[in-house]
């Protein structure tokens, strides 16, 4: 059980207040984290509160400003990047968001040696992506879907690609589906370790069907937004990977990296690229039916100036029980011999663990094992491997950082974080300097987040980087809800849940229950993290009990739970929420006439299906930006879990798992349906079809759209959304305004 610090003294309680919705909407109780921008083994940059860019040297204890806030302000810079030779800084301004990761910006180059902006051969605008080479101060950038190279910031550019075309050919940047569902980045180019080569992806979207929606804006006529967006079963982007020698880019030009034969025989994806050395690169490919992944190690052939990917350096990863990997196929972390690597994949017991691959995957040496999962490999040095897992005390929703000594035999394991601030900190991530000389730990909870700096050899804490003192003081007179993380055992399934309880919770009383659900494949909602958010307010002020349940399909508890939903989305996720609700009712403190469910995106889909389950458990519910049919969602995501919507594959379940098919069942619940009209991700089409089906079935429901808003419903829409949902729930639960 994780309890927030309790306040039991009566004298204190008089001065304490509940959270208000305004607190949440204003972000009054938001926290800060500190991630050093490492520039060497012992130095990092950080943007100070007054916007100076400061360089810190851990070993000398000295710090100095490398770029003043005045310089930043002169171009309205919101971001920066120091060149590895420390001669130049790019300043980023005019940020303009595109999709989840992508944005365009204007870039200025500041010369630190003379304290002036570089004049002549200035960068064009707006730029889609820009980065320094890992050594020196070469620049690669993407402008109008083409890649350019600059030897130095003041030099004219060298154009690498010429075929870039809006919505057709993307060079060095992903198209919509690769950005959102495969790469999870705004870029698709990768410098080799010393900057000799530049690898990049070319995405050809020429044959992809286009999603078109209106953007109303302020003009007389709305604009139409067109995005090549492959829905399930549709034509996919065609990807090619090229590598160019940046020292003499014109000589042989971009060289295409061959696709493994077993991948190229049918539709496929490129999933990631990892440089090993300047002349060795590792590419990962995935069949369209995403249960086979191939890792291919390629070498530069000087004589032919080409890249050779021998079959002996192809490593196949296959899943027989589900899809390959977790959410994504894991990426390799190469060791110092530049051929063997460490990688997370399922062991024979169906738990994701670190394996060491020296020659073949079949001969992989398992490094971690147990009924828990290794989650991320942070760094491999000559003698240590740092990773995170949820092993400690068997809580899947925790993250601790471990060090395995790979230099000694047998390797010894040490938990770096488990006992540091045990009550406050159970969910960590880490950021390492070069050669893991130092590292920062960022603790996300369950207590107030704290960021600390550590010695990479001894693990000794050197200093606190951010401890959120202001937040701690601000919370002193707030009646925060209590939180507990527990599990239910049902039919050989473990259902972990987080319950958020009103401050004066009394087990002998009855409380309205709100289920917050996401439930998507490989997601996790029950995490030991700190948050003061809308549901905290609902518990603190409105006296609701809120529960989050991780059912089948969720992550980090083994493949049995994860792959249970394979090819059957919309069944077990819903069943497990319902099962949990029944168990909560049995606990005796839930008013079974006042139970609601809400979710966003995949959670909107699950909440809709739960409301339409015909159980009579739910009085009301909310779906924000829900998927309503898997035929409407992106191919890469949907097909990973559902296969293809074809007769000879899985069309039947595609049809059976829609929200529309259950329209009649909404008759006995209060349903609030919400969607942004400019949602590029889960298209408004999804809610439009739910609404149409409900109207056709003559079922009453409530709805709210947000004009020109995307999947995030940001800005003023956020305030309106949460205010609207609060009113809806209070009305549903008969709570007075």
């Amino acid at each position: 059980i994780v309890l927030r610090p309790s306040r039991v003294h009566n004298s204190e309680e008089n001065t304490m207040r509940a959270l208000t919705l305004k607190d949440i909407l204003n972000g009054t109780f938001s926290y800060k984290t500190f991630f050093p921008n490492w520039i060497s083994g012992q130095e990092y940059l950080h943007q100070s509160a007054d916007n100076n860019i400061v360089l810190y040297n851990i070993e000398t204890g000295q710090s100095y400003t490398i770029l003043s806030n005045r310089t930043m302000k002169s171009v309205n810079a919101s971001n920066y990047g120091l060149s590895p030779d420390r001669q130049f800084v790019y300043l980023e301004s005019d940020y303009s968001k595109l999709w989840r990761y992508s944005y365009t910006a204007t870039y200025y180059i500041y010369d630190l040696s003379n304290g002036e902006f570089v004049r002549g051969n200035e960068l064009p605008r707006p730029i889609q992506y820009l980065c320094w080479s890992p050594v020196g101060s070469k620049l690669a950038y993407v402008y109008q879907n083409n890649i350019y190279l600059k030897q130095r910031p003041g030099d004219p550019p060298f154009q690498i690609t010429f075929n870039g075309r809006e919505n057709k050919i993307f060079n060095g940047i992903p198209d919509w589906v690769y950005e959102e569902e495969m790469l999870a980045t705004k870029y698709a180019l990768w410098w080799s370790p010393n900057g000799k080569f530049l690898a990049y992806a070319e995405f050809n979207d020429t044959d992809i069907p286009v999603i078109a929606y209106s953007y109303y804006g302020d003009e007389q006529y709305p604009r139409t937004i067109n995005i090549p967006y492959p829905k399930a079963g549709a034509k996919n982007p065609v990807v090619r990977i090229f590598i160019i020698d940046t020292t003499y880019p014109a000589y042989v030009g971009p060289q295409e990296v061959p696709v493994p034969a077993m991948i190229a025989s049918s539709d496929y994806y490129f999933s990631w690229l990892t440089w090993v050395t300047d002349e060795r690169v590792c590419l990962q490919w995935l069949k369209r039916v995403q249960n086979v992944s191939v890792l291919s190690i390629c070498d530069f052939r000087e004589d032919w100036q080409t890249w050779d990917c021998p079959k002996t350096q192809e490593h196949i990863e296959e899943s027989r029980t589900g899809w390959a990997g977790g959410f994504f196929v894991s990426t390799p972390v190469f060791s110092y011999d530049a051929i063997s690597y460490y990688k997370i994949f399922s062991d024979k017991d169906g738990y994701k663990h670190i394996h060491y691959i020296k020659d073949t995957v079949e001969n992989a040496i398992q490094i971690t094992s147990g009924k828990w999962e290794a989650i991320n490999i942070f760094r491999v040095t000559q003698d240590s491997l740092f990773y995170s897992s949820n092993e400690f005390e068997e809580y899947p929703g925790r993250r601790n950082i471990y060090r395995i000594s790979i230099g000694s035999y047998p390797p010894s394991k040490k938990c770096v974080t488990c006992h540091l601030r045990k009550e406050r900190c159970q969910y960590y991530t880490a950021s390492f300097s070069d050669y893991a000389k130092y590292y920062a730990l960022v603790c996300y909870g369950p207590g107030i987040p704290i960021s600390t700096l550590h010695d990479g050899r001894t693990d000794q804490e050197i200093k606190i980087l951010e401890e959120n003192k202001e937040l701690e003081n601000a919370l002193k007179n707030i009646q925060l809800p209590k939180e507990e993380i527990k599990k239910l055992e049902v039919d050989e399934i473990t259902l972990w849940y987080k319950m958020i309880l009103p401050p004066q919770f009394d087990r002998s009383k009855k409380y309205p229950l709100l289920i917050q659900v996401y439930g998507g494949p490989c997601s996790q909602s029950v995490r030991s993290v700190f948050a003061v958010n809308w549901i905290s307010y609902l518990a603190s002020k409105e006296g609701m009990v809120i529960a989050l349940v991780d059912g089948r399909g969720t992550a980090f508890q083994g493949d049995k739970l994860l792959y249970a939903v394979y090819r059957k989305l919309g069944v077990y996720e819903v069943e497990d929420q319902i099962t949990a609700v029944r168990k909560f009712i049995e606990m005796g403190f839930i008013d079974e006439k006042r139970i609601a469910i809400w979710g966003w995106s995949y959670g909107g889909y699950v909440s809709s299906l739960a409301l339409a389950s015909g159980t009579g458990l739910f009085k009301c519910g909310i779906a924000v930006a829900p998927v309503s049919s898997w035929e409407y969602y992106a191919s890469v995501y949907t097909e990973r879990f559902m296969g293809l919507p074809t007769k000879d594959d899985n069309l039947e379940h595609y049809k059976n798992s829609t929200v529309m098919a259950r329209a009649e069942y909404f008759r006995n619940v209060d349903y609030l349906l919400i969607h942004g009209t400019a949602d590029d991700n889960v298209h408004f089409q999804n809610s439009a079809q739910i609404a149409k089906a409900l109207v056709n079935a003559q079922v009453d429901f409530q709805a709210m759209w947000y004009s020109d808003q995307n999947h995030g419903l940001s800005g003023l829409s956020t305030n309106h959304l949460y205010t609207h949902m609060t009113h809806f729930l209070k009305q549903c639960f008969s709570l007075s305004d």
């Epitope: 001669q87 020196g136 070469k138 060298f158 154009q159 020292t247 880019p249 014109a250």
Partner: antibody, heavy 118, light 107 residues
Framework: EVQLVESGGGLVQPGGSLRLSCAAS????????MSWVRQAPGKGLEWVST????????AYADSVKGRFTISRDNSKNTLYLQMNSLRAEDTAVYYC???????????WGQGTLVTVSS | DIQMTQSPSSLSASVGDRVTITCRAS??????LNWYQQKPGKAPKLLIY???SLQSGVPSRFSGSGSGTDFTLTISSLQPEDFATYYC?????????FGQGTKVEIK
């Protein structure tokens, strides 16, 4: 400001040797391809030799291969051309030039005259 | 080696004239074609790189076009200081080669 200054030219007998130097300033010399280009009196431009940054790999025109050697000293920001077994047809103004991306000559020196005559 | 052929080898023109010089490569050089101006007793000066990009500081009356094997340098309105010899150069190979030059003289 980028500057390239050649030196070492002069009169030499056929079969003789000469070493040209090119002092570079105003840019990070080690990052760039560098070349020698020559121009015989009243004639057009002829590329002679190129040296790459980083690994200092070299290339030569067929007319000078085996006789001329290009080299660089990145610590001194200097480019060299060692010319052996000189012939009358090697008489020319020799220009040192920066070869951006190994593709175009964006900065040139003022040139140094080499005369091969008996 | 790639051979570069310029035409004409010389031309006479007046101030204000539009002048066009062509350059043909013996094999495809993509867009790796550059143009230089040289005045007597001086070093060559880069005008156009990558077929059509104007070098910083070069007047906009100079323009380049073409790709593959055929390229053009155009001076939209000839100025007195433009009387010089112009060279094309391919940079597609490790052995760059120059055209024989085009001398632009006063009519």
């Amino acid at each position: 400001e980028v500057q390239l200054v050649e030196s070492g030219g002069g009169l030499v007998q056929p079969g003789g040797s000469l070493r040209l130097s090119c002092a570079a300033s105003g840019f990070t010399f080690f990052s760039y391809w560098m070349s020698w280009v020559r121009q015989a009196p009243g004639k057009g431009l002829e590329w002679v030799s190129t040296i790459s940054p980083y690994d200092s790999s070299t290339a030569y025109a067929d007319s000078v291969k085996g006789r001329f050697t290009i080299s660089r000293d990145n610590s001194k920001n200097t480019l060299y051309l060692q010319m052996n077994s000189l012939r009358a047809e090697d008489t020319a103004v020799y220009y040192c030039a920066r070869l951006l991306y190994g593709t175009w000559f964006d900065y040139w020196g003022q040139g140094t005259l080499v005369t091969v005559s008996s | 080696d790639i051979q570069m052929t310029q035409s004409p080898s010389s031309l006479s023109a007046s101030v204000g004239d539009r002048v066009t010089i062509t350059c043909r490569a013996s094999q495809i050089v993509r867009t790796y074609l550059n143009w230089y101006q040289q005045k007597p007793g001086k070093a060559p000066k880069l005008l156009i790189y990558a077929a059509s990009s104007l070098q910083s500081g070069v007047p906009s009356r100079f323009s380049g076009s073409g790709s593959g094997t055929d390229f053009t340098l155009t001076i939209s309105s000839l100025q007195p200081e433009d009387f010089a010899t112009y060279y094309c150069q391919q940079g597609a190979q490790l052995q760059p080669t120059f055209g024989q030059g085009t001398k632009v003289e006063i009519k």
